[in-house]
Interface confidence: low
């Protein structure tokens, strides 16, 4: 009579994580007699996925009933396969002996690989505000997967970017996979309602990528610009300073008036109203009493914007003793202030 | 005391790439802003890039595109890559450390905050 | 841009004021080069902090967009080229001026 082989049909087999995985094995003859085993991997550290004699296997359950004594189907099925399964599967007959079977004979393996979906592609930015023209990394991570082969783009809104670099670890086999990119981004002005976007591509998704969003609001900050402007005077004594402060993100602001280096009032951006790119405009006014001052005013408008250093615009309003025609409104020079003639 | 330890320089040829290291001890590394300056044969200093907290960097108008700055904190190392090296790269290359860690004025300007410099690394580029 | 003046001269014990003028929101420091391609020294950063290592006789301060490197008492080793560093003011890109070429009479 033949010797008795150990046949696996599939030296492999493809499985999506969750699955059950059919290993086939079938043997040619009955003799000699003994049980069957399944192990996972070859050698000293083989591990036993299934003993047909003894043991409890919750995971595995057989083809074929292996207590039919003509039975020389041995496949298993493996449930709820996870990325953890993947590995070369034997099938291996034993002879009865005593004290202990002897190994018989092996078949020649078969190879589970395991598709797992890649996790939700999470995007996280810089830990600090960066301000527009500069450039600032996002990274995207998603791990979990297998196969290796996977496809990893960036886009903001809707525009691809090609500035990046992309990690798919670890380099050698293994079960799972993760893959780790970063891409670089300029900010513009207009960043505020922007969203960077990375996209995951794998065969388990079946044409459905995966997507990571960030949105640059968290991470632009865009410095506002000041102007103080004198308006027309309200009373023959009085006069109305506004400081408009514009084009800024994100909303916290705090405006001091000083008055010839003296603090006069400190308030908070409120009532802000938006641009259309997403940053603010505000607008804080004070009524100067002139007829108080017997010297040159200087006002100062004094912004501290989203914890940064203040930045600030003067304006002189000279006091004259003897009546001049008001002069016309126009914004305060970068450099230094308008003179006014105030009676 | 701080010191920062260039090294990379040397001849390149055009169209090529280079890779500088600085090597910075006496403070705490991780800490701080770093960054790299240049300057050509008969010119005056410029810009090339900055890392800064949170790993935003910037890079000087003349490299942008080109340069990729990177940081090791383990190590107390900022990297310069640079690729596409063209003949006005020629010049020495001085690593720099900022006096802080973020940004200031709502901006990351890294040329107004340095308190520590390299002694230089020569770039030559040249076929 | 940043715009500092190409050069200044002074006599021994003078005052001398070099100027900068760029970013009115942004800060500048301040750098002594002594000969090209030799590591500059940093005088002043963050517009007006000093090094410990640095005289008191250097000073920065700034008004509006225009900084300005104070060095008082001028001696014969002050000679160098100064260089002032921001940010431009439209870009927001970091860069330096152009270097003051400082000649002690």
């Known amino acids: 009579e033949e010797e008795l082989q150990v046949i696996q049909p599939d030296k492999s087999v493809l499985v999506a994580a969750g699955e059950t995985a059919t290993l086939r094995c079938t043997a040619t003859s009955l003799i000699p007699v003994g049980p069957i085993q399944w192990f996972r991997g070859a050698g000293p550290g083989r591990e036993l996925i299934y003993n047909q004699k003894e043991g409890h296997f919750p995971r595995v359950t057989t083809v074929s009933d292996l207590t039919k004594r003509n039975n020389m189907d041995f496949s298993i099925r493996i449930g709820n396969i996870t990325p953890a399964d993947a590995g070369t599967y034997y099938c291996v007959k034993f002879r009865k002996g005593s004290p202990d079977d002897v190994e018989f004979k092996s078949g020649a393996g078969t190879e589970l690989s395991v598709r797992a979906k890649p996790s939700a592609p999470v995007v996280s930015g810089p830990a600090a505000r960066a301000t527009p023209q500069h450039t600032v990394s996002f990274t995207c991570e998603s791990h979990g997967f297998s196969p290796r082969d996977i496809t990893l783009k960036w886009f903001k809104n809707g525009n691809e970017l090609s500035d990046f670099q992309t990690n798919v670890d670890p380099v050698g086999e293994s079960v799972s996979y993760s893959i780790h990119s970063t891409a670089k981004v300029v900010l513009t002005r207009e960043d505020v309602h922007s969203q960077v976007i990375c996209e995951v591509a794998h065969v388990t998704l079946q044409g459905d990528p995966l997507r990571g969003t960030a949105n640059l609001s968290e991470t632009i900050r865009v410095p506002p610009t000041l102007e103080v402007t004198q308006q027309p005077v309200r009373a023959e004594n009085q006069v109305n300073v506004t400081c408009q402060v514009r084009k800024f993100y994100p909303q916290r602001l705090q405006l001091t008036w000083l008055e010839n280096g003296n603090v006069s009032r400190t308030e908070t951006a409120s009532t802000v109203t938006e641009n259309k790119d997403g940053t603010y405009n505000w607008m804080s006014w004070l009524l100067v009493n002139v007829s108080a001052h017997r010297d040159d005013v200087k006002l100062t408008c004094q912004v501290e914007h989203d914890g940064q250093p203040a930045v600030s615009k003067s304006h002189d309003l000279k006091v004259s003793a003897h009546p001049k025609e008001q002069g016309s409104n126009t914004a305060a020079e970068n450099t230094g202030s308008n003179e006014r003639n105030i009676y | 005391a701080v010191t920062l330890d260039e090294s990379g320089g040397g001849l390149q040829t055009p169209g090529g790439a280079l890779s500088l290291v600085c090597k910075a001890s006496?403070?705490?590394?991780?800490?701080?802003?770093m960054g790299w300056v240049r300057q050509a044969p008969g010119k005056g200093l410029e810009f090339v890039a900055a890392i800064y907290s949170g790993n935003s960097a910037e890079y000087g108008a003349a490299v942008q595109g080109r340069a990729t700055i990177s940081r090791d904190n383990g190590q107390s190392t900022v990297r310069l890559q640079l690729n596409n090296l063209r003949a006005e790269d020629t010049g020495i290359y001085f690593c720099a450390k900022d006096a802080g860690s973020g940004c200031y004025s709502g901006v990351c300007a890294g040329t107004s905050s340095i308190d520590a410099w390299g002694h230089g690394t020569e770039v030559i580029v040249s076929s | 841009a940043v715009t500092q003046p190409a050069s200044v001269s002074a006599n021994p014990g003078e005052t001398v004021k070099i100027t900068c003028s760029g970013s009115?929101?942004?800060?500048y420091g301040w750098y002594q080069q002594k000969s090209p391609g030799s590591a500059p020294v940093t005088l002043i950063y963050e517009t007006n902090k000093r090094p410990s290592n640095i005289p008191s006789r250097f000073s920065g301060s700034k008004s509006g967009s225009t900084a300005t490197l104070t060095i008082t008492g001028v001696q014969a080793d002050d000679e160098a080229v100064y260089y002032c560093?921001?940010?431009?003011?439209?870009?927001?890109?970091?860069?330096f001026g152009a270097g003051t070429t400082l000649t002690v009479l």
């Open positions: 009115s929101s942004g800060s």
């Open positions: 006496g403070f705490t590394f991780s800490s701080f802003n």
């Open positions: 560093g921001s940010e431009d003011s439209s870009t927001y890109l970091s860069i």
